[in-house]
Each structure stands twice: as C-alpha cells, then as structure tokens.
Interface confidence: low
C-alpha cells in the first residue's frame, strides 16, 4: 500500500527587498534512492486564510532526503499584510500508474514581516524599493488608528487606493516613470478632523531601463591592443548607492576570455600573440535589474585604425611646386598604406590618393606663387579599408614669381595752357597675378615726337596714381609692376598731341538699382577696345574715379557697383582705343542710379509788387547739385478767391487744404509773373522743384498783400 507523500517541514522565509516568499520543504516517505516526478500545489492567502490570492502548481523531480525550494514574488510589499501558505502534492510519475491522488494540505504557515514597530501610528511600504521605469508597483500604508483619515501623495499629487482591511490600504501605481535619480517621493498623512496626527514617506527608486549598448566597435592601431568603444546610452545609476552605474563586460567566445571594463564607454583588450585573426565579442551591460548584450564578429586585419602620420615636411619648395613627405607608424611587415592628401589654398581644396610602404612622398604641382597652403595627410590600411587615421598637417608658402599680368591703367587728361596734365591711375594686381608683394611701379614716359627722350618714375606701392605734366607732344606711357622677383608685362597708353574731342554732347541716362546700362556707336576704323570711365558729378574727379575695359566688338556694357548711391549723379565718358593705343572720346553720359526728390526748395524773391500783380524769381537756385534731374517747378498759390487764376488749376495739399497750382516744365525758367490780382488782397505762395521722384520738401507759404491802386511801391 502506497503511503501518501505529504509535504512536511514547510518553512517560509521572506525577502522584503524582493517582496518574495521562499518556501522550503521535504517529502516524507519517499522510496530510498528513487526519483519521482511530482506536482506540488501551492496556495497563498492574504490577511486571513480564507482570502486565497494565488494558486499554482510546481512540477519537479524529487529525491529522497531532498529539500525542495520555491519562491513567489508578491506585488504587495510583505510588510503590508500577513500572508499564509500551504502546500499539497501529487505523484505524476510513470513508475506509479493511476490512480494518482492529491495528498492532504500541509498546515497553513503564517508569514508576517513586522516592520511597523515602535510608537508611530502610520507606516508606508515598501521602503527604498528599486524598480525599472514602466513597471507596475503596489504600495500601501498601515494605520494603527482606524479613526484616522489618511491621504497619500505621489510627488505631491493625491493618489487613491483600495482598502484591504481597516488598517491597510493599497495603491496600484501603473507604469511608473523615472523622475529623478534620487527617487520618487511618496508620503501619507494621517489626520483627525483638521489636526495632523503624523506623516510618513518612502522613496521609490525608479531606474531608467538599461539600454542595449549602441555603436559597439573594436579596432587596433598596433596589432597589440584592441580598443573597443560603444555608446552606453542612459546612465542607470541611482542616488544613495541604490544602484551603481551599469557595468560592462567584454567576452570573446573563441578564446573564452572575459574582461570587466572599468570605463563606461570604452575598454582595451590585449591581443595575444597566438595569431588569432577572428574575434567574436559580446559586450554585456548589466545593472541590478537586467542585462543587455550586443555582439560583433570581425577579422582583426579588417579593423586597423592607424595612428596619424608624422614628420610632415615640404622639400624643394619653389613658386609652383613642392614635394610633400611624411612618415607612417610601421605596424606590420609588408603593410601597404593608402594615404589621402588634402591641399588647401586660395579657397580651393585638392585631394590626392597615394599608396605607400613606409615613407610617403607626393609631388605637388601647379601651385600659385607666394601663396600659403595647408597640406594634410591621413592614412589607412590599403588592403582592407576600415577607417582613415586622423589628419596630420603642416603649412607651407610657395616662393614669389614675377607678376604675370600688366596693371590695368587709365588716365585723365586735362589741358592746361601749353601742356597736358595727365593723371595716371592703375588698379592693384590681383593676388593671382601679383605673385608676391608689389614693391613699386615703374612709369616710363616716352616722347613719341622725340624718340630718344624718355623718363622713368619709380613709385612705391601701394600708390595707385601719379600726375604727369607733359608738353603738347604725343607720349607713350608704360606702367610696370615690380615685386622682389621681377617685373610684370608693361601696360601701354598713348597720349595724343591733339586735344580731346570737345564737340561731344552730354546725354542724360537713367540708371536702375542694378547700375547703369550704357551703349554707344562704334568708333570708325580699327579699335582694340573701349574704355568707360566715371566719377561723381559733384566731387573732385580723383576722389572716386573708376573705369572699365570693354572688348572691341562690344558697344554696350552694364556698370554695376555697390558704390552707386541714390541721389548722386554720375558722369560717364566712353573712349575708343585705336590700334596705336590712342584714346578718343566718343560719348559723354550723365545720370543717377536712382533719382530722389529735391532736397531743398529755392529761395524766392518777390519783385515788382503792384495792386494787380507781383513777380516771383529764384535765379540763384542751382539745378546741378540736386539728387535728381530738375524737370521744373510747381507754384502753389492761395487766396480768398473761389476761382483759380488763369493757367493755375485746383490742387489739394497734403494737409487737405485747397489751393491753386501752376506747373513750370522748364528747369531753367526761374521766374513767374502772377497777375490778374485784386488790390488790397492777401495771397500766399510756395514754390518747389520736382524730379522724376517727386517734389521738394513741403514748407511754409510766403504771404504777400497787394497794395491799393493809388499806392506806388
């Protein structure tokens, strides 16, 4: 007859931190040296035995004299309520065919975690619990006095729970968030009426979820050490030593070696000299709550990250070439390096690739003279490209060369009695053509009528003009720029003995915001080009004199520059250049890039005042120095009369008042007789010029009273 195999010696211990019950028992009457498959049913009750909250089965193989263990984790902190546990068993083994029957239940084992001792009337659990963000947590309070009203708050916000018995209320916190690394504050307050009886709080330590390490990668620079790096993601460390920062361990499966990493985002792995080429690394991140791991498999020779090249030098540097040399750290015999050179200079970047063994050399050609360059080099494994090394660079400057272009030269010729005054201008050579620092300009003046006669003027840089007084002969003038190496080609200009073409009429032109669009009739005969020069009409010519060269087949150009200002008049002259380099004035033009309304009104005089008329005149008003071409004048007249005088028409002023207006369309007509007036009458007038942009500024009217018929003025 089979004896019932009843669980005996049931002991229950607790782990408050883990909120777990640990059951320990043995099975009596088991056959010696036999193993049986058994099922144990476990019942757990809370507060009282009849309140069963959990039932479950645990299957295992049981030996004689074996102590069995099983654990259960409670959602509710164990301090919140008494728990009761009992167990029964069933043989579920083929050695014992049916009928199988359950044993009797063991007696209830009471589990009470007494942490509500002392004089306090209120307790909150669990204390200092560590959980992961997003988990569900149950907390409770235990109140000694059931007459007390207890309110609980999570980070200051009231929470509501479920009463388990008159002394205990539980609160389910769903998907708890991470708030701060020093924990989430929860407190409860007991009160009777409006009187506080006491307050208790706990800190719930919510850890951020441990992330899988990202961007895990290993590389070597010397075949001695592998340098592994990763992005650890969020640090899961919590305050008060509740949870340290996650730890990282490297495991290499081929060698079976393991290393605890002492840094949060990198670890060095010693490469043993046993010619292991393939590595299979697992990086394990671990904190108190979970583990995460990532894997990489690679061939060592495919993960070479070289140290940056060194000893970068430049040899045989001249104006247009240089030899760049460098060294690389030798890491293995017969290793081929792929190196990339970057050359930066004059706002440009060139890139070159070269394969080398030990020392690098590259011939840099087609360089600009007198230019500072920055050259840098980086290298990688040519056989299995993984990653470029860091750059190593150095600056060098090419030597100067003779200037490569003639200066751009122009002139202003003014006729004085018996001679020409020639003001010669030149533009500084661009860096591209100067090929170094321009030190001086040589101006050679040669009298074409007396070929043996010539003069040399040496003008130190940075001067860009000079004045020559020449007699009424023809002259050839050469301008040459010089630097420390040599001279530029000469720029040649010829000054004719004949005076400039005086008969050229000046034409008015209208500019735009973009500048001035100019066109002209081609010069008869052969021309080698045209020159357009210009300056501010009102200023000294030398102040802002500019010119532009135009090709021989072009008879129009647009002069656009930021220097053109609204309300400023510019004078343009267009010259043709003959094959003999003699300039002939073809056309003159004048205009504004943008006309403005007149800046002032004329000073008006009242003449010949009679009982029936008066004369207005403003002879002194200059039309030249205005911010636009004066097109004429508006004469405004006010009187008591309802009707406007002949030639005047009704107008409304900006203030809304009515008056009479007369328009003069000739800017040089600077007088007006106002007649048909009544004696002893009161009149007011105001005169303003106008341009295409509008009238001059508004001003006060001037008052005039006509005398009686018998008076004489």
């Amino acid at each position: 007859e089979r004896l019932p195999l009843t669980p005996v010696s049931l002991k229950v211990s607790t782990n408050s931190t883990r909120q777990s019950l640990h059951l320990q028992w043995t099975v009596h009457n088991l056959p010696y040296h036999q193993e049986l498959k058994m099922v144990f049913q476990i019942q757990i009750s809370r507060i009282e035995t009849s309140n069963v909250i959990w039932v479950g089965n645990y299957s295992t193989t049981v030996k004689w004299n074996q102590v069995l263990h099983w654990s259960w984790e409670s959602e509710l902190p164990l301090e919140c309520a008494t728990h009761f546990v009992r167990i029964k068993s069933l043989v579920d083994d083929a050695k014992f065919p049916e009928p199988n029957f359950w044993s009797n239940w063991s007696s209830w084992e009471e589990v009470s975690v007494q942490d509500s001792t002392g004089q306090d009337i209120l307790f909150v659990f669990p204390k200092d619990k560590l959980v992961e963000e997003g988990t569900n947590v149950t907390i409770c309070y235990v109140s000694r006095n059931i007459q007390n009203n207890v309110s609980c708050y999570l980070e200051g916000k009231q929470i509501h729970g479920e009463q388990l018995d008159p002394h205990v209320t539980a609160f389910n916190l769903n998907s708890v968030p991470f708030i701060r690394n020093k924990g989430t504050n929860i407190y409860c307050e007991a009160s009777q009426g409006n009187v506080s009886e006491g307050m208790k709080g706990i800190v719930l330590f919510v850890s951020k979820v441990l992330e899988e390490p990202k961007d895990f990668s290993c590389e070597t620079e010397d075949f001695k050490t592998l340098h592994c790096t990763w992005d650890p993601g969020t640090d899961t460390a919590l305050g008060w030593s509740k949870q340290p920062s996650q730890s990282y361990t490297l495991f290499e499966s081929f060698s079976g070696e393991k290393k605890l990493c002492t840094h949060k985002n990198w670890c060095n792995w010693q490469i043993t000299q046993d010619s292991q080429e393939t590595y299979n690394f697992t990086l394990i991140a671990e904190n108190y709550l979970r583990k995460r791991s990532v894997n990489i498999l690679f061939n060592l020779t495919h993960r070479v990250y070289l140290m940056n090249p060194f000893s970068v030098n430049f040899e045989n540097v001249n104006a247009t070439n240089a030899i760049m040399t460098w060294k690389v750290h030798s890491i293995r015999n017969n290793f081929t390096y792929l190196c990339q050179i970057e050359l930066h200079g004059e706002g440009k970047m060139m890139q070159y690739n070269v394969s080398i063994k030990v020392n690098g050399e590259y011939f840099l050609s087609e360089l600009e003279p007198a230019t500072e360059y920055m050259a840098r080099v980086r290298c990688a494994d040519a056989s299995h490209f993984w990653k470029w090394s860091e750059w190593s660079g150095q600056n060098f400057t090419t030597l100067e060369a003779a200037p490569s272009e003639a200066p751009d030269v122009w002139r202003i010729v003014s006729l004085e009695p018996g001679n020409h005054t020639v003001t010669l201008f030149w533009k500084p050579l661009s860096k591209l053509h100067a090929n170094g620092k321009i030190l001086f300009y040589n101006v050679v003046v040669e009298n074409l009528d007396k070929p043996s006669s010539s003069e040399l003027h040496s003008i130190p840089a940075p001067a860009n003009s000079t004045k020559l007084i020449l007699d009424r002969c023809s002259y050839q003038i050469c301008v040459i720029a010089n630097n420390s190496v040599g001279a530029s080609p000469a720029s040649v200009i010829v000054i004719s003995a004949d005076p400039e073409n005086k008969e050229v009429e000046e034409e008015r032109i209208a500019g735009t915001e973009g500048g001035f669009s100019l066109s002209w009739k081609p010069q008869p005969g052969d021309v080698i080009g045209y020159v357009v020069d210009w300056c501010d009409h009102t200023q000294d010519v030398l102040g802002d004199f500019q010119w532009k060269n135009v090709g021989p087949n072009t008879t129009s150009t647009v002069i656009s520059t930021d220097a053109f200002r609204p309300g400023v008049r510019y004078d343009f002259r267009i010259y043709g250049l003959s094959t003999k380099r003699i300039a002939c004035l073809l056309e003159k033009k004048t205009g504004y890039s943008q006309e403005l309304a007149p800046s002032d009104n004329p000073h008006v005089l009242v003449d010949t005042l009679t009982s029936h008329s008066f004369t207005l005149s403003w002879k002194d008003y200059s039309t030249e120095s205005q911010p636009g071409f004066i097109q004429g004048y508006h004469v405004y007249l006010k009187s008591k009369a309802r009707q406007c005088h002949p030639r005047f028409e009704k107008a409304v002023l900006s203030d809304g008042s009515e008056c009479c207006k007369y328009k003069i369309d000739n800017p040089e007509e600077k007088a007006l007789i106002v007649d048909n007036l009544k004696p002893e009458s009161f009149y007011e007038f105001f005169i303003t010029p106008f341009t295409s942009a509008g009238e001059g500024p508004s001003a006060t009217f001037t008052k005039v009273t006509t005398p009686d018929e018998h008076s004489s003025m």
């Epitope: 690394n181 640090d235 460390a237 919590l238 305050g239 008060w240 030593s241 509740k242 949870q243 340290p244 920062s245 730890s247 605890l260 990493c261 002492t262 840094h263 949060k264």
Partner: antibody, heavy 120, light 107 residues
C-alpha cells in the same frame, strides 16, 4: 603625471568639524570614482567613503555614516570630505584615492595623506 | 558588511622564496577583490585587481587567483623590495572592506 594632494587635516577637539580637500591633476578627473581611506596609527586600512564619477552613487563606512559627507567638484578637479561630530577614534592618516573606473573597482592612485588628530 | 580575513597575519621569508597569502570573504564577492602593498610611511600601492589582473607596472612575480570567497596572492620569487604589509580588499558591495593585513618580514 597623475597626482593627488590632500589638505585640511589638523588637531581638532571632539564634537567639532573639519573639511578635507583633495586636489587631482594629470588625469581626466570626471572619468573616475574617488575614495577616502584612513589608517589609524599602527593599524590597517579602513575605507571611509566613496563617490562615483558623477556623484550618482555614494557610500560610507558604518562608523562614519551620518557624520561624514563626501562630495566632489568635477569643474575644479577636487574631492572633499566634510567631517562633523568628530570622535577620538577618527584620529588617523586620511588618504584620497582614485579608482580604476567610474564605480568602485580598485584604487590605483593614492595621495600621501593628511593627518587628523581628534583630542581634547 | 562583508568581512575579509587574511592569513597569516605575519610571515617571515627569505629572498627567492615563493610566498602565498590568502584572503577569505564572509560572503561571495565574485571576483571583486584587490591586493595592495604598503611600505612603512608610504601610501598603499595597487598590485592586483579583479582577483587576478596585474596592475600596470607591477612585476610579473606577483599573481592573484580565486573567486567567490577564497583568494590568494602569490609572490613567485621574493625580492628585497617586496618586504611590506599586504592587504586584500573587496569592492563587491558597500561598505568596501579591507583585510586586517599580512606583514611580510625578512627571515
């Protein structure tokens, strides 16, 4: 080179306070945990307190808990130990030590120590 | 707290000897165990960390082994400069604890 220099030690009466400082140089201070370890005359080593690289984890020996406070200022490369309610048994040579990692692993660099004497 | 017990407390040996010092933890500390050497009037020096990893610059005659609760420090061939006091230390849990020390003297 890597160096730790302690200061702030001296003679103090029981119940009074003292603040120790440790100036670090030659390494990236905020990449490592730091410790205070003491040695009473003729005795062995006793760990006093430790602080992780970002101050997220702090630990104390039971004998000093509630009286001593460890802190660090990464911007100043400095470690501190505020000692309150000093007792005669706190008399010792106090070492500042650098950990090999960001948490508590092992102490690879030590200062020369500063002496604290608690006596009436 | 994890109690660390070193044995022997003191030890006499000669230059060239092989010496072993043991350290026992009151509970498992995994491999979170370090060994230090201290000479009179000097600060301690880290010899071995993680039970068996030799600290950079430490001679290879020093070695460590063990895991869990039992650990050993071995000096394969004593040199004159090795006579000092040796401490084990666990960093498995706080508070960190040291052994009471083993004094190694010249015989």
């Amino acid at each position: 080179q890597v160096q730790l220099v302690e200061s702030g030690g001296g003679l103090v009466q029981p119940g009074r306070s003292l603040r120790l400082s440790c100036a670090a140089s030659g390494f990236t201070f905020d990449d490592y945990a730091m410790h205070w370890v003491r040695q009473a005359p003729g005795k062995g080593l006793e760990w006093v307190s430790g602080i992780s690289w970002n101050s997220g984890s702090i630990g104390y020996a039971d004998s000093v808990k509630g009286r001593f406070t460890i802190s660090r200022d990464n911007a100043k490369n400095s470690l501190y130990l505020q000692m309150n309610s000093l007792r005669a048994e706190d008399t010792a040579l106090y070492y500042c030590a650098k950990d090999i990692g960001v948490y508590y692993y092992g102490m690879d660099v030590w200062g020369q120590g500063t002496t604290v004497t608690v006596s009436s | 707290d994890v109690q660390m017990t070193q044995s022997p407390s003191s030890l006499s040996a000669s230059v060239g000897d092989r010496v072993t010092i043991t350290c026992r933890a009151g509970q498992s500390v995994g491999t979170y165990l370090n060994w230090y050497q201290q000479k009179p009037g000097k600060a301690p020096k880290l010899l071995i960390y993680a039970a068996s990893t030799l600290q950079s610059g430490v001679p290879s005659r020093f070695s460590g082994s063990g895991s869990g609760t039992d650990f050993t420090l071995t000096i394969s061939s004593l040199q004159p400069e090795d006579f000092a006091t040796y401490y084990c230390q666990q960093s498995y849990s706080t508070p960190i604890t040291f052994g009471q020390g083993t004094r190694l003297e010249i015989k």
